[in-house]
């Protein structure tokens, strides 16, 4: 029969024959022969291969360097890489999470729309009318102005996006 020019999924062409790829978690040792299947070996400790492959070397698991603020979120296996995340108060600088930076704080006049995670930074939003933030914080949302009316008080000083309203007693009508 004619030697194949293409092979099925999970196979590769070598020496005019189709050989099985090594399964995830294993590397290629020797191509298949006319008598035997492909020879593969498991990846070593701290190594992985995540696809059907003909790789001669397994990949090293990612190292979550604590000096860069990283910690292990999910330990790698022979078939998966280690997933790093950042220490509390820090977040990844990229999708690959190779280093971390401190969560940003929202300045006065801005509140936290979304609290930061290990992989995303704080999202701030300007405090709309009726709300304020007088602190720089990575957690505080914009607070609503105090309602003077509900306390039987009146507004003595209008609020801003950075300050609350100041309430005071109502003026009494003289007899």
């Amino acid at each position: 029969p004619e030697p194949p020019t293409a092979c099925r999924e999970k196979q590769y062409l070598i020496n005019s024959q189709c050989c099985s790829l090594c399964q995830p978690g294993q590397k290629l040792v020797s191509d298949c022969t006319e008598f035997t299947e492909t020879e593969c070996l498991p990846c070593g400790e701290s190594e992985f291969l995540d696809t059907w492959n003909r790789e001669t070397h397994c990949h090293q698991h990612k190292y979550c360097d604590p000096n860069l603020g990283l910690r292990v979120q999910q330990k790698g296996t022979s078939e998966t890489d280690t997933i790093c995340t950042c220490e509390e108060g820090w977040h990844c600088t990229s999708e690959a999470c190779e280093s971390c930076v401190l969560h940003r704080s929202c300045s006065p006049g801005f509140g936290v729309k979304q609290i930061a995670t290990g992989v995303s930074d704080t999202i701030c939003e300007p405090c709309p009318v009726g709300f304020f933030s007088n602190v720089s914080s990575a957690f505080e949302k914009c607070h609503p102005w105090t309602s003077c009316e509900t306390k039987d008080l009146v507004v003595q000083q209008a609020g801003t996006n950075k300050t609350d309203v100041v309430c005071g007693p109502q003026d009494r009508l003289r007899a």
Epitope: I14, L28, S30, T36, L41, P42, H57
Partner: antibody, heavy 116, light 110 residues
């Protein structure tokens, strides 16, 4: 067709050296681990060493560590075994074999005799 | 790195079945399914008969079969024939990334 042809064997005195070669053909040499296996006269098989595709991984049986060195030249489709500090107990037929831990193909062997 | 343990000799009559055992440790036979069996006729190079515990290379008679339980692998030859008379060796990959062979078993067909 796969062919493995060993050469370089011979008579050598204890403490001497030899370099064995294995010329490979009929397959993609550079994508296969290769091994050396020996057999003393009238005795069983003994695995000696193996080497991965690019030569970055090499493994040896304890009894030859520090004395034998396995290497390869993918451009020449050749496998080598450098034998130093030879002892009488190294006397054997030395076979090269294709693969890392299972061997469908063997050479015809080259005889190493260590004797004074 | 001591050799895997095989019986020195086994014999059987034509048509019978025989089993050759190969005992290792949890660092070799028991660690992986990377056990092979070789047949060696006098003056010849070894021939692969079984690989990865149970797989038979194409061209090898289906009278040859392999199995493993714990740290012991076995080669069974059924319907014994005169041409099966030979030495048989097991080999196993180890956790040290090395290979280890058994001492060999001489099979005699009576």
């Amino acid at each position: 067709e796969v062919h493995l042809v060993e050469s370089g064997g011979g008579l050598v005195q204890p403490g001497g050296s030899l370099r064995l070669s294995c010329a490979a053909s009929g397959f993609t040499f550079s994508s296969n681990w290769m091994s050396w296996v020996r057999q003393a006269p009238g005795k069983g098989l003994e695995w000696v060493a193996n080497i991965n595709q690019d030569g970055s991984e090499k493994y040896y049986v304890d009894s030859v560590k520090g004395r034998f060195t396995i290497s390869r030249d993918n451009a020449k489709n050749s496998l080598y075994l450098q034998l130093n500090s030879l002892r009488a107990e190294d006397t054997a037929e030395y076979y090269c074999a294709r693969g890392g831990y299972r061997y469908a193909y063997w050479g015809q062997g080259t005889l190493v005799t260590v004797s004074s | 790195q001591s050799a895997l343990t095989q019986p020195a000799s086994v014999s059987g009559s034509p048509g019978q079945s025989i089993t050759i055992s190969c005992t290792g440790t949890s660092s070799d036979v028991g660690a992986y399914n990377y056990v092979s069996w070789y047949q060696q006729l006098p003056g010849k190079t070894p021939k692969l008969m079984i690989y990865d515990v149970t797989n038979r290379p194409s061209g090898v008679s289906n009278r040859f079969s392999g199995s493993k339980s714990g740290n012991t692998a076995s080669l069974t030859i059924s319907g014994l024939q005169a041409e099966d008379e030979a030495y048989y060796y097991c080999g196993s990959y180890t956790t040290s990334s090395t290979l280890i062979f058994g001492g060999g078993t001489e099979l005699t067909v009576l």
